[in-house]
Structures are given as C-alpha cells and as structure tokens.
C-alpha cells in the first residue's frame, strides 16, 4: 500500500521570500528504493486553472522546472518527498500536487500554499495645516499581503489603564498596491491635545493574517505639545 500525506489542514502559509519547504511524506509497506521510484511536483496558479510541472525525480535523473526547486534524495530514503522552493514569491501561491510512483502503484496529495507578507508599521506626526492644539498622528503600514488589514487606535490613561478603542476622529485611507504586489495603507488619528491628559498612551494596533500577534506602535502625550520623539516619528516599529 502506497500513501502520501501533505500538510494537515490542506493549507501551508509561508512568508514572502522565504525558503519554503512544501511537505510531502510517503508511507509504503516496504523500504523505499529511490532508484526505482518517481516523484513529480505540480503547481496550479490561483489565477489560471492550468497545472505546471515544478520538479521531477526519477531514479538518478532530477530536473527543476522552477529555478532552485529541489527534492532531496537523502530525505527520500526516509520517505520524505518534500519540495523546497527558495525565495518564494507572491505569484507562486496556489495548489501544489505531490505525485509519487512506486511501480505499479501511484499516490498523490495536494496542498494550498499561501504566501503572506508582514506589514512594517511606523508612526508619524503631521502638523501641516493643523489648528492650534490640534495634532494629526499617522500610522503607516506598508509591504503587507494579502490586502485585508485591520488598523485600530487605542488609548490608556492613568485613570483607565486598560486600553480603550478610539472610534472618533480616526480616518483610514484606501489600500494602495505597490509594484511588487504588496500593499500600503495609512490610518490617521486627530487629537486635540488641550483636551487630553498628559501621560496618556496612544497605540496604533495593526492586525494582519501574517502576524501571530498584533503590531503595536505607541506614543505618549506629554505636557508639551508634539511629544513624539524623533525615533517615534521615523522608526519602523515592527
């Protein structure tokens, strides 16, 4: 009996530019002789329904149809037919199929590969055109994929140390697509510093599929206006 097992759940998520290993394990009732077996990996794009050969291994012959693609003969001896793709790109997401032949038996499995890019986040203070005692804080999130992203603002005061979500005076712009396929978005918070307590901590909170935990960038309101430090203005908070 010949069986192939792919990633549990049928989906594998990988970061953009990672050297991804797409898992495929072979279960066979006898020891594997790699000189008399074949492995073929196929890819089907998300955008068109055509299957393309990525890698082929037969006996001593192996061929990569995608540059850098590799199945390890050393790993194969232990039943591991995983495919390694160095420097994975967004457009390489889709369905991957691992087909194993141990004559006369054939087995296959498929997995969906999702490629994600994590946002970088930074806070900026924009004073241009603002009225007296009014500040506009911008939270820029850039380089993320997929497009869906959630940006919220929270504040913590000395009276209320638990974060409170701010819903007023928040404007989040449209997402902008970059040349490389990733996205950028900016969310703005308008503050009237004369009405806010010094020591209040404000946070821009970014939630995205690529992040295990939300990305938080914060600043503290001090007695003086425009309390953002230089690092807070320009640093990447990721």
């Amino acid at each position: 009996d010949l069986k192939v097992e792919m990633m549990a759940g049928g989906t594998q998520i990988t970061p953009l530019n990672d050297n991804v290993t797409i898992f495929c394990n072979i279960f066979y009732s006898q020891p594997l002789n790699i000189t008399s077996m074949g492995i073929t990996w196929f890819w089907k794009s998300l955008t068109f329904d055509k299957e393309v050969k990525v890698f082929e291994f037969f006996g001593d012959h192996q061929e990569a149809f995608r540059p850098g693609a590799i199945v390890s003969p050393w790993r194969l001896k232990s039943g591991d037919a995983s495919l390694r793709l160095p420097g994975i790109q967004l457009e390489e997401a889709g369905e991957y199929r691992c087909e194993v032949v141990v004559t006369p038996l054939k087995a296959q499995g498929t997995v969906q590969l999702e490629v994600v890019a994590s946002p970088a986040s930074r806070l900026l203070l924009d004073q241009v055109g603002m009225k007296e005692n009014e500040d506009k804080y911008m939270c820029e999130s850039s380089g993320f994929y997929p497009e869906a992203i959630n940006i919220t603002w929270e504040k913590q005061t000395q009276k209320f140390p638990h974060p409170i979500e701010i819903s007023e005076d928040v404007i989040t712009g449209p997402t902008i697509k970059n040349m490389d396929g990733t996205f950028n978005v900016t969310s703005c918070l308008k503050l009237n510093s004369s009405q806010e307590d010094p020591g209040t901590v404000y946070q821009c909170v970014v939630r995205h599929a690529s992040l295990h935990t939300p990305l938080r960038s914060n600043f503290t309101l001090t007695a003086a206006r425009h309390s953002l430090s230089e690092t807070e203005k320009t640093d990447n908070f990721s």
Epitope: N19, V20, T21, F23, W74, R75, K77, S78, D80, S82
Partner: antibody, heavy 119, light 107 residues
C-alpha cells in the same frame, strides 16, 4: 541570524536520564531536520539520530536505540534529546545541528551541552 | 554500518603548506560526503558538502574531491587558523558515520 541555542551543562548519576534542549531561531523551524551528535572528551564525533520537526519522524543510530528519544515543540521552535539509563561512557558534549537542506551534512550547530555522568 | 577510515590521524605542517587528508568508505557512497573543521572547545564547522561543494563563507583554499569510496580534503595554503581537527561524514546511508578525525598541528 540563524542559530541554535542549547540548554546548560548537566551532572547526572548513572542510571538517570538527561534531557537536552535546542532552541532554533532565524529560520522556519519545521523546514529543516535537526540532528544530534555527541563527542566524548578527547574523542571523535558520533551521530545519534535526527528528527523531522514538521512530522516528528525520527531516525536513531542503532547504538542508542531504546535509550534515546528525540522530540520537538514547534510552538517554541525547540528540539529535545533525552537519553536514559545513563552510563559513565555517556559523559560527552552533546550537539544539536541543523541539516544543510536536503543533505546529511549540518551547517548550523548549537554551542554544545556538557553532560557529566558521575556517582 | 558504513565505516569511514580517515588518514592520517594527525599531521604536522607549517603555515603556507599544502595539506591533504584522505577518507575511505567501506562501500560506495557516491558523493554523499561532508568535511568538517573543529577547533578546540568549539562546535564543528561545515567546509564541504556533496564531496566537492564548498559551503558558503568557507575560504577557497579548502577543496574536496572524490566519489565512490575514496575522498580527499585539500588545504592549498595552510593558514594559522586552520590548525584544528578535521572530520569526514558519510550521509549515503543510515546510520550516518564520521571518520575518526585528523588533527592538523603546527610543525
């Protein structure tokens, strides 16, 4: 950067067990096999086995079969090697090492964990 | 298990010397062989994989040759930092086995 950080030195009595940890960082933990290699004082290198962090599959050298257990916790990117029924000749530096993808060579090594077995 | 016999077990050489270390496998291992350098008190460091491929970041004075059962590691011009112990490793078959090591000492 890519690195493996091992737990600290251990002193054990004969017959006891030791569990050494190996924390990976800077790469996708599940994508590369972790091997364990030991080196007795003044001696050469001895391969103990490997674990596939993705599947948990293992392959142990015959010498250690029945005494060694290799496990992993993918949530904290850590591999473990437990050796039981320790003897005085198990005193050695134990290394974890990451494979160079798809070959049996190892291009990233932990700093080593000294295990002393003494009554 | 495949036996890996390394020779010599030790050698003395001077800076600038050309040094060759040999590793012989007890059966055909194709080119599934690696070479490691180990300095005292440190973890080994991969020099060569697949018998002749230089690991990235390793100086080009190190080279590997061979296929089947006979393999060599050559250091074309020995440098002060090359005084160390060298090991070969076969990964053609389980269990993986190391050679006994070659200690390169200062003459």
């Amino acid at each position: 950067q890519v690195q493996l950080v091992q737990s600290g030195a251990e002193v054990k009595k004969p017959g006891a067990s030791v569990k050494v940890s190996c924390k990976a960082s800077g790469y996708t933990f599940t994508g590369y096999y972790i091997h364990w290699v030991r080196q007795a004082p003044g001696q050469g290198l001895e391969w103990m086995g490997w674990i596939n962090p993705h599947s948990g599959a293992t392959n142990y050298a015959q010498n250690f079969q029945g005494r060694v257990t290799m496990t992993r916790d993918t949530s904290i990117s850590t591999a473990y090697m437990e050796l039981s029924r320790l003897r005085s000749d198990d005193a050695a530096v134990y290394y974890c090492a990451r494979e160079r993808w798809g070959s049996g060579t190892f291009n990233i090594w932990g700093q080593g964990t000294m295990v002393t077995v003494s009554s | 298990a495949i036996q890996m016999t390394q020779s010599p077990s030790s050698l003395s050489a001077s800076v600038g010397d050309r040094v060759t270390i040999t590793c012989r496998a007890s059966q055909d291992i194709r080119n599934d062989l690696g070479w490691f350098q180990q300095r005292p008190g440190k973890a080994p460091n991969l020099l060569i994989y697949a018998a002749s491929s230089l690991e990235s970041g390793v100086p080009s004075r190190f080279s590997g040759r061979g296929s089947g059962t006979d393999f060599t590691l050559t250091i074309s011009s020995l440098q002060p930092e090359d005084f160390a112990t060298y090991y070969c490793l076969q990964y053609y078959n389980h269990p993986l086995t190391f050679g006994g090591g070659t200690k390169v000492e200062i003459k």
